[in-house]
């Protein structure tokens, strides 16, 4: 894109972080080989990417997790990419589901989500999972990002 | 992006190739329905995509493999997207892990990696896997590419 | 990209739809949180994304499915991203394969495909699967899109 000041590049890539919070929303950090192009996209409260400009964005997330069928609920592991726009209810943009592995003690699996969506100024995107304790936080395994078209 | 000569499009998409090399680095070729936009991105030694211009790039890889749990080590199949910048050590950008299947003789699985990263002039990206003999090289199953924002 | 009228943004994201058709080509709709930037990309017959302008496009698809090894053929579940250019034969751009789960009644798995390809004016892309009856059409699980670089 290599845009001028009127039209700067906007992109982010953040890295997963283990959290003591008992929430299904994954936590992220600007650490390791992260990307934060400028202040037109920000990581808020370690949980959501918020954009200042309206437009089309390619948004993606990757989640690696380790689970076992016997030790988990019958429901699959689901990762959801969600949107919160100002004055609107949250909504699901993308989801992926993987049934738990029969491998012991747990079987690793990776999920990738990605798509093009219109975001309003102040819109935030975040990632939900069914069980955050199963998520792998080793280098490169779980990440989240976006780029403005 | 449709950029002028000062700011040309930079993109690549290369196709996996079976190799007699006993290395964990996957081999690629400009064959089939490949993309190589211009000489600002090149495929070097059939193993790495090297860029001439600094900037933000969306880099991705897809690896399909066939493996069996009994015949494999307990470790999962891991695909890693790695970066080598001039004068720097290699580093992992992204990884995905899938536990081997119990299917006989082997169970196929596909991994997709992708993210936005800042690359320096002369930086190279490549893909590592735990066992290249398990990788599927049928049409469309395993590929690697990037695009400059 | 934020382009002028001469060079508008071109992007689409469409949502899967269950179909009574006995075809392996997945059906899509402009519903929910979909994207259709302008008439330079269109959804035709609910099955293919067709572009009016030549250029490089990042094309992606995500398919979530639920299958069981005993109830399925020995062949894996395969999702294919295919191209039909005017006056040319169809060709496979990308494929992913996942062996069926042993989970009962079925095990869910998600596949993600994505890559950069040159498209000609009037070119269409579509998604084929081995068994459409296994595809999950819940919110966000199965989608298809593209963006012009």
């Amino acid at each position: 894109m290599q845009k001028g000041d009127q039209n700067p590049q906007i992109a982010a890539h953040v890295i997963s972080e283990a959290s003591s919070k008992t929430t299904s929303v994954l936590q992220w950090a600007e650490k390791g080989y992260y990307t934060m192009s400028n202040n037109l996209v920000t990581l808020e409260n370690g949980k959501q990417l918020t954009v200042k400009r309206q437009g089309l964005y390619y948004i993606y997330a990757q989640v690696t997790f380790c689970s076992n069928r016997e030790a988990s609920s019958q429901a699959p592991f689901i990762a959801s990419l969600c949107l919160k726009s100002p004055g609107r209810f949250e909504r699901i943009l993308l989801r992926a589901a993987n049934t738990h592995s029969s491998a012991k003690p747990c079987g690793q699996q990776s999920i990738h989500l990605g798509g093009v969506f219109e975001l309003q100024p102040g819109a935030s995107v975040f990632v939900n999972v069914t069980d955050p304790s199963q998520v792998s936080h080793g280098t490169g395994f779980t990440s989240f990002g976006l780029l403005k078209l | 992006m449709q950029k002028g000569d000062q700011n040309p499009q930079i993109a690549a998409h290369v196709i996996s190739e079976a190799s007699s090399k006993t290395t964990s680095v996957l081999q690629w070729a400009e064959k089939g329905y490949y993309t190589m936009s211009n000489n600002l991105v090149t495929l070097e030694n059939g193993k790495q995509l090297t860029v001439k211009r600094q900037g933000l790039y969306y880099i991705y890889a897809q690896v399909t493999f066939c493996s069996n749990r009994e015949a494999s080590s307990q470790a999962p199949f891991i695909a890693s997207l790695c970066l080598k910048s001039p004068g720097r050590f290699e580093r992992i950008l992204l990884r995905a892990a899938n536990t081997h299947s119990s299917a006989k003789p082997c169970g196929q699985q596909s991994i997709h990696l992708g993210g936005v990263f800042e690359l320096q002039p002369g930086a190279s990206v490549f893909v590592n896997v735990t066992d290249p003999s398990q990788v599927s090289h049928g049409t469309g199953f395993t590929s690697f590419g990037l695009l400059k924002l | 990209m934020q382009k002028g009228d001469q060079n508008p943004q071109i992007a689409a994201h469409v949502i899967s739809e269950a179909s009574s058709k006995t075809t392996s080509v997945l059906q899509w709709a402009e519903k929910g949180y979909y994207t259709m930037s302008n008439n330079l990309v269109t959804l035709e017959n609910g099955k293919q994304l067709t572009v009016k302008r030549q250029g490089l496009y990042y094309i992606y698809a995500q398919v979530t499915f639920c299958s069981n090894r005993e109830a399925s053929s020995q062949a894996p579940f395969i999702a294919s991203l295919c191209l039909k250019s005017p006056g040319r034969f169809e060709r496979i751009l990308l494929r992913a394969a996942n062996t069926h789960s042993s989970a009962k009644p079925c095990g869910q798995q998600s596949i993600h495909l994505g890559g950069v390809f040159e498209l000609q004016p009037g070119a269409s892309v579509f998604v084929n699967v081995t068994d459409p009856s296994q595809v999950s059409h819940g919110t966000g699980f199965t989608s298809f899109g593209l963006l012009k670089l």
């Epitope: - | 079976a18 190799s19 493996s67 003789p105 599927s136 090289h137 | -």
Partner: nanobody
Framework: EVQLVESGGGLVQPGGSLRLSCAAS????????MGWFRQAPGKEREWVST???????AYADSVKGRFTISADNSKNTAYLQMNSLKPEDTAVYYC?????????WGQGTLVTVSS
């Protein structure tokens, strides 16, 4: 192009033995496994046995203890020693291998177990 050629099939009495061979030819860069499937008349093709590149063998329950798979990696050849054959082992036996990143199949060899 890689090819798989089976040999060793034939007619044998119940309780007898046969040794099948599968030779891979062509430019072979990598091998993950070689092995066997079989298809009895009017039935689906079923997996029989596999030997993986690390030497690990695997067998279907129906042939465990009677069949032994082995490989000569220097010759890109796999062998299936079939002992204590039963009439229900009658089938076309297909060599299957994961070579150069793809599933390859032989043309098949007929094994008939009958008195």
């Amino acid at each position: 192009e890689v090819q798989l050629v089976e040999s060793g099939g034939g007619l044998v009495q119940p309780g007898g033995s046969l040794r099948l061979s599968c030779a891979a030819s062509g430019r072979i860069f990598s091998t993950y496994f070689m092995g066997w499937f079989r298809q009895a008349p009017g039935k689906e093709r079923e997996w029989v046995s596999t030997i993986y590149s690390n030497g690990t063998p695997a067998y279907a329950d129906s042939v465990k203890g009677r069949f032994t798979i082995s490989a000569d990696n220097s010759k890109n050849t796999a062998y299936l020693q079939m002992n204590s054959l039963k009439p229900e082992d009658t089938a076309v036996y297909y060599c299957a291998a994961w070579l150069n990143g793809g599933n390859r199949w032989g043309q098949g060899t007929l094994v008939t177990v009958s008195s």
